[in-house]
């Protein structure tokens, strides 16, 4: 007998063909021999089976000898052997209906686990193979688990259920609730305005929650809450903000913070957390602020950076249009008795300039 796989909630068409291409008597029955549908004269009649309100046939194809049965809104319990009786012959079709669902909300926080559960008819022994949007392959039986969701797991998961050499494909949309970046660093000269942006890696129709930015200044012994805010239907409202620094926050998404001035005492790293309504856990984004200052004091030209820098970053001082006068993998460089002219302080990573500050050295007579 023919095996057909169906998806819960979908529509399936079970085919039955007569040898003669003409309208003739036919019946579809279930394994209990209870009539589902059939033809009486020119009319489709329905029997009292459980499929009575969900089964139909393409009347337009009857005169071509095609007597298919269409079952809408498939349920797992529709799995059965169906019998088509036409021209004194019986055709059997085994229908197996499967369902694949995420057994929690499909909107999950980064780091949370995802479990996909397969609903299958009794006596079946299917296998499941799922592919994440990022190309990760996971196999399983009745359940498939992804222990720690990553940002790149957001999107459509494609799962293939196999049974009796037949396959049926499910697509499940998973939204990983996270910020677009796990970490970002802002490089600023002393005195410049600082813009921090925290774009989300997802969109929700209604986005409600609350958040806070904790800041650990390099010079401070402990961290401090710089700002707390509420999010209601994508509208941001500040609850509490420190006096120093006095941060400003944008009213719309993406979350946007402005620090009026980059000062060495603010250099450090922060952690923005966002707790979403009806979700356990929080979204996190780390943000770093590196501040540069170039000063001339008596015969000493100094360039310093504060904040979290990697040891491989290079700090250089050079006179304009000349090679580097001094260059170190350090947080401060200086030149004694500098030549007059425009000096550049550069913070670079493998030749790529991250931050530069110019200072004019005037001749001393």
């Amino acid at each position: 007998k023919k095996v057909v796989l169906g998806k819960k909630g979908d529509t399936v068409e079970l085919t039955c063909n007569a040898s003669q291409k003409k309208n003739t008597q036919f019946h579809w029955k279930n394994s209990n021999q209870i009539k589902i549908l059939g033809i009486q004269g020119l009319f489709l009649t329905k029997g009292p089976s459980k499929l009575s309100d969900r089964a139909d046939s393409r009347k337009s194809l009857w005169d071509q000898g095609c007597f298919s049965m269409i079952i809408k809104n498939l349920k797992i319990e529709d799995s059965d052997t169906y019998i088509c009786e036409v021209e004194n012959k019986k055709e059997e079709v085994e229908l197996l209906v499967f369902g694949l669902t995420a057994n929690s909300d499909t909107h999950l926080l980064e780091g949370q686990s995802l479990t996909l559960t397969l609903e299958s008819p009794p006596g079946s022994s299917p296998s499941v193979k799922c592919r994440s949007p990022g190309g990760k392959n996971i196999q399983g039986g009745r359940t498939i688990s992804v222990p720690q969701l990553e940002r790149q797991d957001s999107g459509t998961w494609t799962c293939t259920v196999s049974q009796d050499q037949k396959t049926v494909e499910f697509k499940i949309d998973i939204v990983v609730l996270a910020f677009q970046k796990a970490s970002s660093t802002v490089y600023k000269k002393e005195g410049e305005q600082v813009e921090f942006s925290f774009p989300l890696a997802f969109t929700l129709e209604k986005l409600t929650g609350s958040g806070e930015l904790w800041w650990q200044a390099e010079r401070a012994s402990s961290s401090k809450s710089w700002i707390t805010f509420d999010l209601k239907n994508k509208e941001v409202s500040v609850k509490r903000v420190t006096q120093d620094p006095k941060l400003q926050m944008g009213k719309k998404l993406p979350l946007h913070l402005t620090l009026p001035q980059a000062l060495p005492q603010y250099a450090g790293s922060g952690n923005l957390t966002l707790a979403l309504e009806a979700k356990t856990g929080k979204l996190h984004q780390e943000v770093n602020l590196v501040v540069m200052r170039a000063t001339q004091f008596q015969e000493n030209l100094t360039c310093e950076v504060w904040g979290p820098t990697s040891p491989k970053l290079t700090l250089s001082l050079k006179l304009e249009n000349k090679g580097a006068t001094v260059s170190k993998q350090a947080k401060a460089v200086w030149v004694l008795n500098p030549e007059a002219g425009m000096w550049q302080c550069l913070l670079s990573d493998s030749g790529q300039v991250l931050l530069e500050s110019n200072i004019k050295v005037v001749p001393t007579w």
Epitope: Q33, I34, T45, G47, D53
Partner: antibody, heavy 120, light 107 residues
Framework: QVQLQESDPGLVKPSETLSLTCTVS????????WSWIRQPAGKGLEWIGR???????NYNPSLKSRVTMSVDTSKNQFSLKLSSVTAADTAVYYC??????????????WGQGTTVTVSS | DIQMTQSPSSLSASVGDRVTITCQAS??????LNWYQQKPGKAPNLLIY???NLETGVPSRFSGSGSGTDFTFTISSLQPEDIAAYYC?????????FGQGTRLEIK
């Protein structure tokens, strides 16, 4: 064993809506169709329609425009509403369980019936 | 809808008699026919399903036969407790329909 009990609406006025509830005890309402059948005094049986535990329904075309059936699985009850009643709707109303088996489809458990009189 | 015609509409018989009731369907219903017994003031009770199969717990004096459009219900030896109305019911197609009933009384 499974028992069915129809509610008693008593007297219903013409043009009003008749409401009946059938309570299932000694078993679950799930996985079965449940029918309503009526019988005017001294006459035969008329099938009104049926409802499945999931809420899907089939109604007798002769009454379809006036019939609404619903199910409450949490209370193990199913209900019938018949609108715009007339004296012709006066009858004993039965609820019954429909059971399917191999070549078998029958109403194997019935309520004791409730008399509904339509009169002003 | 499928019409079910029962005959006779009433009959009188003696205890021990063989009693036969017929039921005719307006179209072919294969073997999708039930027979019910309804005692006065009570709900109907399923006796026979699929034209000829005895429901569990039903005495063997009751039997049924037929297929297609013509069906027969028989009580081989009438007992006093068999006084009731008997109904045929088709379950080939929706809506489910009943015969108009046969009233059986004892002479």
């Amino acid at each position: 064993q499974v028992q069915l009990q129809e509610s008693d609406p008593g007297l219903v006025k013409p043009s009003e809506t008749l409401s009946l509830t059938c309570t299932v005890s000694g078993g679950s309402i799930s996985s079965y169709y449940w029918s309503w059948i009526r019988q005017p005094a001294g006459k035969g049986l008329e099938w009104i329609g049926r409802i499945y535990a999931s809420g899907s329904t089939n109604y007798n075309p002769s009454l379809k425009s006036r019939v609404t059936m619903s199910v409450d699985t949490s209370k193990n009850q199913f209900s019938l509403k018949l609108s715009s009643v007339t004296a012709a709707d006066t009858a004993v109303y039965y609820c019954a369980r429909d059971r399917e088996g191999y070549y078998y489809y029958g109403m194997d458990v019935w309520g004791q019936g409730t008399t509904v009189t339509v009169s002003s | 809808d499928i019409q079910m015609t029962q005959s006779p509409s009433s009959l009188s018989a003696s205890v021990g008699d063989r009693v036969t009731i017929t039921c005719q369907a307006s179209q072919d219903i294969s073997k999708y026919l039930n027979w019910y017994q309804q005692k006065p003031g009570k709900a109907p009770n399923l006796l026979i399903y699929a034209a000829s199969n005895l429901e569990t717990g039903v005495p063997s004096r009751f039997s049924g036969s037929g297929s297609g459009t013509d069906f027969t219900f028989t009580i081989s030896s009438l007992q006093p407790e068999d006084i009731a109305a008997y109904y045929c019911q088709q379950y080939d197609s929706l809506p489910i329909t009943f015969g108009q009933g046969t009233r059986l009384e004892i002479k």
